[in-house]
């Protein structure tokens, strides 16, 4: 799997999980989240050569086509596969609220 | 939806469905498929600015972050959403076989 266990420990220019910290106020301008200050969101990046963690049969077709016709820009792309939620604390007036924001943390990647 | 009905009728630089014909022999080197000779595979391409058909909350976070730090290459990517199978005819010896290859045709796209 193209997850932290593999990607963070290896030199990998191909599609892989990359670490990325997001600060809510600084990076997104979100001042309504009280806790946490930020979180490890991660992201997916890297090349998708033929058969590198291909998501579907179409992805395989496209990556094979792309090797022959690179100028067509019809290549697969490295995107998130498994995502996890993030628990946040915010206030409505003086009332604290705890909520789970779904699909906030990328755990693994794929070529699609 | 970023499908043929919308994308093929509009000039759209952002993420959208793009037409692409694949000839099995010429483009993939697949000589085993007897019929069809090729098919309209289509593909997804284009920019993913903030809130353009965002797949998940993480996609929204990433596209917003990317406006501030484009050099991070941490931007969402335009990928396939809905896919359809393709029915093919091939031979094992002299025996014709009909099979459905799943996820061969892209019908719509998303930013992920």
């Amino acid at each position: 799997a193209l997850d932290a266990a593999y990607c963070f420990r290896n030199v990998q220019d191909n599609c892989c999980l990359r670490p990325l910290y997001i600060d809510f106020k600084r990076d997104l301008g979100w001042k309504w989240i009280h806790e946490p200050k930020g979180y490890n969101a991660n992201f997916c990046a890297g090349a998708c050569p033929y058969l590198w963690s291909s998501d579907t049969q179409h992805t395989k077709v496209l990556s094979l086509y792309n090797t022959i016709n690179p100028e067509a820009s019809a290549s697969p792309c490295c995107v998130s596969q498994d995502l996890e939620p993030l628990t946040i604390l915010y206030y409505i007036g003086n009332t604290p609220k705890i909520e789970q924001l779904s699909n906030m943390i990328v755990k693994s990647c794929k070529c699609s | 939806a970023l499908d043929a009905a919308y994308c093929f009728r509009n000039v759209q630089d952002n993420c959208c469905l793009r037409p692409l014909y694949i000839d099995f022999k010429r483009d993939l080197g697949w000589k085993w498929i007897h019929e069809p000779k090729g098919y309209n595979a289509n593909f997804c391409a284009g920019a993913c600015p903030y809130l353009w058909s965002s797949d998940t909350q993480h996609t929204k976070v990433l596209s917003l972050y990317n406006t501030i730090n484009p050099e991070a290459s941490a931007s969402p990517c335009c990928v396939s959403q809905d896919l359809e199978p393709l029915t093919i005819l091939y031979y094992i010896g002299n025996t014709p076989k009909i099979e459905q290859l799943s996820n061969m045709i892209v019908k719509s796209c998303k930013c992920s």
Epitope: R18, P19, K25, N40 | -
Partner: antibody, heavy 119, light 107 residues
Framework: QVQLKESGPGLVQPSQTLSLTCTVS????????VHWVRQPPGKGLEWMGL???????RYNSALKSRLSISKDTSKSQVFLRMNSLQTEDTATYYC?????????????WGPGTMVTVSS | DIQMTQSPASLSASLGETVTIECLAS??????LAWYQQKPGKSPQLLIY???SLQDGVPSRFSGSESGPQYSLEINSLQSEDAVTYFC?????????FGSGTKLEIK
């Protein structure tokens, strides 16, 4: 363990180009960002620029026209090139890593390499 | 660029005392502040990040705090090895900027 080490010429002529190498071990350049920071003798620290794990770069606007940062991930090396050097560029040059990309503080530093600009 | 005004430039204190070094940011940096210790001829070492988070392996006598745009580094029970130079750094906006440094001496 995580290590960074700078190397390059100790002496550079004015108007010439400075080339420095930062060789890292214990982590991958496709995972972490690397920054360059310099410190003139007896003075404070100046952030120069960084190279992202994905290869993108960002420079201090005061140095942008003269500065270039690149890397060779397979060799675990980051390179700094700065042209049109003047005596005020005399400094110790450090490479440093941020603990998570976009955290922007530096948890590991190289020992530094002293560069003197003089004729 | 965000200016970081660090004070005092130098400071003298006795062993066992508590000392405070301050940094004033020219604009809101939302707690994105780090503190470093630098020994002569050595590279800086991270002490504190996010204004108050202690870096792994750093003694607990070091602590960080904030009050509006003012950020502080406090060193309790001063020891002889603490007599070096300290820098603050804002990690909020490009270009990342440092304070001018505080040289701490033992009386």
């Amino acid at each position: 363990q995580v290590q960074l080490k700078e190397s390059g010429p100790g002496l550079v002529q004015p108007s010439q180009t400075l080339s420095l190498t930062c060789t890292v071990s214990g982590f991958s350049l496709t995972t972490y960002n690397v920054h360059w920071v310099r410190q003139p003798p007896g003075k404070g620290l100046e952030w120069m620029g960084l190279i992202w794990n994905t290869g993108g770069t960002r420079y201090n606007s005061a140095l942008k026209s003269r500065l270039s940062i690149s890397k060779d991930t397979s060799k675990s090396q980051v390179f700094l090139r700065m042209n049109s050097l003047q005596t005020e560029d005399t400094a110790t040059y450090y490479c440093a890593r941020d603990p998570v990309p976009n955290k922007w503080h530096f948890d590991f530093w190289g020992p530094g390499t002293m560069v003197t600009v003089s004729s | 660029d965000i200016q970081m005004t660090q004070s005092p430039a130098s400071l003298s204190a006795s062993l066992g005392e508590t000392v405070t070094i301050e940094c004033l940011a020219s604009e809101d940096i939302y707690s994105n502040l780090a503190w470093y210790q630098q020994k002569p001829g050595k590279s800086p070492q991270l002490l504190i990040y996010d204004a108050r988070s202690l870096q792994d392996g750093v003694p607990s006598r070091f602590s960080g705090s904030e009050s509006g745009p003012q950020y502080s580094l406090e060193i309790n029970s001063l020891q002889s090895e603490d007599a070096v130079t300290y820098f603050c750094q804002q990690h909020h906006a490009y270009p990342f900027t440092f304070g001018s440094g505080t040289k701490l001496e033992i009386k």
